[in-house]
Amino acid sequence: LQDPCSNCPAGTFCDNNRNQICSPCPPNSFSSAGGQRTCDICRQCKGVFRTRKECSSTSNAECDCTPGFHCLGAGCSMCEQDCKQGQELTKKGCKDCCFGTFNDQKRGICRPWTNCSLDGKSVLVNGTKERDVVCGPSPADLSPGASSVTPPAPAREPGHS
């Protein structure tokens, strides 16, 4: 025998209280697949979350973050504060990148400058808090009299920024 509930399309639920009739999902709820015995409560985008896509009878609401924040986690489960380039977020708030590290985005962590010498190259442009170093030709490739910038290597225990 076929389960009568399997005929209930998305946007409805199989109502046990009404002889398993397919009833529309109540307001602020949805069912994204057929054959559901209940509808799921719509996600509400409150506070630092804002609505990117409204809830419908067949799909949940989708949230993103208000300006100054960015999404984290699957389906934007968290909003995290933006920082400026050259900073990273810590418990204390936005903090400048430590010497030898950079962040060219408003989110994420400070990363070390590229170690140019790994590829046998030299530093053409020094790194900053906001930008990675630019590697240039290897010192041997430089013409006589030319020189490259050689900043202190970040391969040490960093101090506080």
Epitope: E88, T90, K91, I109, C110, R111, T114, D132, P154
Partner: antibody, heavy 121, light 111 residues
Framework: EVQLVESGGGLVQPGGSLRLSCAAS????????IYWVRQAPGKGLEWIGN????????FYGEKFMGRATFSADTSKNTAYLQMNSLRAEDTAVYYC??????????????WGQGTLVTVSS | SVELTQPPSVSVSPGQTARITCKLN????????VHWYQQKPGQAPVTMIY?????PDGIPERFSGSSDSSSNSAFLTISGVQAEDEADYYC??????????FGGGTKLTVL
């Protein structure tokens, strides 16, 4: 599923060197710090240093500067720890661990199983 | 530089509550995230609490984290302790945002 699998441990003569591997899978290897931490028998956790595999940038604990070298092969999704001039007190389980990229003072969300290095003649 | 101090051992009877302390030697505990790891013999550490009070998926609700500014300490609390909770527990924070600092570890014994 994120995994860190270590290898390369074993018995090493005093004055010798070791090269440990940390093979990563299940995530974008170039986008997370790999930290190296060791634990001597019956002792606590000790930071050796860390590498950003995306560009080879490294940091070393003061105690290990000049003796430890980190590298990464992005084609193999593997990080390496090379340590020279080993002494008996370097006997420990060596771990690699991944740090998430959310904030600058975050936890280690995945650890390798550890590999035991014994320095003895 | 930042140091974290833990008691070497804590003993508790099954079903009781264990509280492990992690004291920050300088600065304000409210400015530092503290993370907690459990380590059983022969195994790698496992995150029990991260960012002061958050529990990773799969960690029982019996484990909770908190901090107290007056004692400048973070706490790992295990309610309704079970035999399987017997392990070493380490707190973890940062000196700079690159340099991790670990407490010396606390051996939890279930009597």
């Amino acid at each position: 599923e994120v995994q860190l699998v270590e290898s390369g441990g074993g018995l090493v003569q005093p004055g010798g060197s070791l090269r440990l591997s940390c093979a990563a899978s299940g995530y974008t290897f170039t986008s997370y710090y790999i930290y190296w931490v060791r634990q001597a028998p019956g002792k606590g956790l000790e930071w050796i240093g860390n590498i950003w595999p995306g560009n080879g940038g490294t940091f070393y604990g003061e105690k290990f500067m000049g003796r430890a070298t980190f590298s990464a092969d992005t084609s193999k999704n593997t990080a390496y720890l090379q340590m020279n001039s080993l002494r008996a007190e370097d006997t420990a389980v060596y771990y690699c661990a991944r740090r998430p990229d959310y904030s600058g003072d975050d936890y280690f969300d995945y650890w390798g199983q550890g590999t035991l290095v014994t320095v003895s003649s | 530089s930042v140091e974290l101090t833990q008691p070497p051992s804590v003993s508790v009877s099954p079903g009781q509550t264990a509280r492990i302390t992690c004291k920050l030697n300088s600065g304000n505990i409210g400015s530092y995230y503290v993370h907690w790891y459990q380590q059983k013999p022969g195994q790698a550490p496992v995150t029990m609490i991260y960012r002061d009070d958050k529990r990773p998926d799969g960690i029982p609700e019996r484990f909770s984290g908190s901090s107290d500014s007056s004692s400048n300490s973070a706490f790992l609390t295990i309610s309704g302790v079970q035999a399987e909770d017997e392990a070493d527990y380490y707190c973890h924070s940062y000196d700079s945002t690159i340099t991790p600092v670990f407490g010396g570890g606390t051996k939890l014994t279930v009597l």
